[in-house]
């Protein structure tokens, strides 16, 4: 997360006293992991299995349709962001199992933990793009008929990815491996050394651009969309409302612990008790944020079953119907069922 937020449980009793006791050996290792770390490992394992398989399936389903179907372009990009993040999980899993020891080298330390941040920014920016698309479909249907095309969608996605990469750079640059003298261990973390102000700036930017600003804009955006669509008799559905709210909320719910602890740690001294307490929860917060990487396919399936009643259909077929159904822009005052349903499908990421 921020500075070197890893504790060293292997040599549990080696540094809890200030008197010499030459009869007590101090370098005997204990193999017990902390409860938050065990929970993190369980979450990582589930996220990896569901995330890799689910997102691979979504990529496979949407890739064929992405040339012509705009919704497929959105979901393809979201799935790619999630899939990439999931690929880093075995490494992060191994590191936690080894009490946060990082034997994978400096390059892996810079790249792999940065993937979850890239995912966060890519997802929220893609979510913002999708939300803008939903908004325009509802409030500017004529404009959409004239200009809403696959080319523009791909450009919007490219811009989102570019900005996400740009926002990930600070964490990438400050991420280094540190080898501790005792217990002998290599740690991977972010080191700002003398620059506490820069550390705080990065944490604040991450909180604002990756959380607070999107939360505000998406809340406003979806409030307007839901008010408009819900006021139409043809689209008045509590299911729609529930799914859209759940879909938008998931991003913020799962990122909240990471963001809160991140901002707190940037303002705390690394030797303070609160910092050390948050430290112990770091892996759990990261794993909780990682749930975003596997939640999308689950929501697509649940939404697909709930709206279209396609319980008897195969999973790829169900996903294809959910993810590639094109929003039809009518000049009439209400949307087609297809539009509302598609809008309700995870129009958010991670």
């Amino acid at each position: 997360m921020n500075s070197f937020n890893y504790t060293t449980p292997d040599y549990g009793h080696y540094d809890d006293k200030d008197t010499l006791d030459l009869n007590t050996p101090v370098d005997k290792t204990s193999n017990t992991l902390r409860v938050p770390d065990i929970l993190a490992l369980v979450i990582f394992a589930v996220v990896f299995l569901v995330g890799v398989l689910g997102n691979a399936l979504v990529v496979w389903v949407t890739a064929f349709e992405a040339k012509r179907t705009i919704n497929a372009i959105w979901f393809l990009n979201l799935a790619v962001a999630d899939f990439l993040s999931c690929l880093a999980l075995p490494i992060l899993f191994t590191s936690i199992v080894q009490h946060h020891h990082w034997p994978f080298g400096g390059a892996a330390c810079s790249i792999l933990p940065s993937l979850i941040l890239l995912n966060m920014y890519a997802s929220i920016l893609l979510l913002a793009t999708i939300s803008a698309d939903r908004f325009l479909l509802v409030f500017k249907p004529i404009w959409c008929q004239n200009f809403r095309g696959a080319g523009l969608a791909w450009i919007a996605c490219a811009v989102a990815w570019g900005l996400a990469l740009l926002l990930t750079i600070p964490s990438f640059l400050y991420r280094v491996v540190r080898e501790e003298y005792f217990p002998p261990k290599v740690l991977c973390g972010v080191d700002y050394s003398h620059d506490k102000r820069r550390e705080r700036a990065v944490a604040i930017v991450r909180l604002v651009l990756g959380f607070l600003w999107p939360l505000l804009t998406l809340t406003i955006c979806y409030t307007f969309i839901l008010l408009r669509t819900w006021s139409r008799r043809a689209t008045r559905s509590t299911k729609t409302l529930k799914v859209v709210v759940a879909v938008v909320a998931s991003f913020f719910i799962f990122w909240l612990p990471y963001q809160v602890t991140g901002i707190m740690m940037s303002f705390l001294e690394p030797s303070s008790p609160t910092f050390l307490l948050l430290n112990k929860l770091d892996s759990l917060c990261v794993s909780f944020a990682y749930i975003n990487c596997c939640i999308n396919p689950i929501i697509y399936v649940v939404a697909g079953q709930g709206f279209q009643g396609r319980l008897r259909k195969s999973l790829p077929s169900l996903l294809r119907n959910v993810l590639t159904e094109e929003s039809v822009v009518r000049e009439s005052k209400s949307f087609t069922r297809s539009t509302v349903d598609t809008m309700a499908q995870k129009t958010q990421a991670v």
Epitope: S3, F4, N5, Y6, T7, T8, Y14, D15, K17, D18, L20, D21, L22, T24, P25, V26, D27, H100, R178, E179, E180, Y181, F182, P184, K185, L187, D191, Y192, S193, P270, S271, F275, L276, N279
Partner: antibody, heavy 119, light 112 residues
Framework: QVQLKQSGPGLVAPSQSLSITCTVS????????VDWVRQSPGKGLEWLGV???????KYNSALKSRLSISKDNSKSQVFLKMNSLQTDDTAMYYC?????????????WGQGTLVTVSA | DVVMTQTPLSLPVSLGNQASISCRSS???????????LHWYLQKPGQSPKLLIY???NRFSGVPDRFSGSGSGTDFTLKISRVEAEDLGIYFC?????????FGGGTKLEIK
């Protein structure tokens, strides 16, 4: 009472190897690590490496290829071996122990072995 | 490697006066367990270094209370409240948080 006593040659010819023995008393080598540090007028105090209680060694990366630390727990002895010595390896060589590891820094030091590399 | 920079190089002081030595590290020295492994040593001519202060501010056994250490993160200070003749020698700061442990260049405390 904790003590570290060093023994080894004072004069080494260039390209030859150096061997120093550190005999400890007052604690067990199976439980505690012993470090080697050298001090030269040009480089000041320089950490060479450590051998932990479980026998794991760690070396200063700049000297890793020429350095070897081993021990004999039963004799309470730790050995430093350094190959291919050059004139800039001329220094006072110390064995030291933190006992409670980095808790206390290097709390106990040997008396030092002055090594001169000269033809 | 962590570079330890000590200032001043030489510190002339009158007996009974206070002396202050600074040490700055190129990286934060906070260990992942929350401790900071920054130590101070005194080396008198012809002797091995002796540990004075461990973990920033803890006095090692037998060290008089006129010696005190302070600091955090990357900036540390050793203070001698009333310098005595036996305090003269070279003072080193050192870190053992990261591999390799590194030492400062030393500060020579001498009579003014």
């Amino acid at each position: 009472q904790v003590q570290l006593k060093q023994s080894g040659p004072g004069l080494v010819a260039p390209s030859q190897s150096l061997s120093i023995t550190c005999t400890v008393s007052g604690f067990s080598l199976t439980n505690y690590g012993v470090d080697w540090v050298r001090q030269s007028p040009g480089k000041g105090l320089e950490w060479l490496g450590v051998i932990w209680g479980d026998g794991i060694t760690k070396y200063n990366s700049a000297l890793k290829s020429r350095l070897s630390i081993s021990k004999d727990n039963s004799k309470s002895q730790v050995f430093l071996k350094m190959n291919s010595l050059q004139t800039d390896d001329t220094a006072m060589y110390y064995c030291a122990s933190a006992l409670d590891y980095s808790n206390y820094g290097f709390a106990y030091w040997g008396q030092g072995t002055l090594v001169t590399v000269s033809a | 490697d962590v570079v330890m920079t000590q200032t001043p190089l030489s510190l002339p002081v009158s007996l009974g006066n206070q002396a202050s030595i600074s040490c700055r590290s190129s990286q934060r020295l906070v260990h992942s367990n929350g401790n900071t492994y920054l130590h101070w040593y005194l080396q008198k001519p012809g002797q091995s270094p002796k540990l004075l202060i461990y973990k920033v501010f803890n006095r090692f056994s037998g060290v008089p209370d006129r010696f005190s250490g302070s600091g955090s993160g990357t900036d540390f200070t050793l203070k001698i409240s009333r310098v005595e003749a036996e305090d003269l020698g070279i003072y080193f700061c050192a870190q053992s948080t990261l591999v390799p442990p590194t030492f400062g260049g030393g500060t020579k405390l001498e009579i003014k």
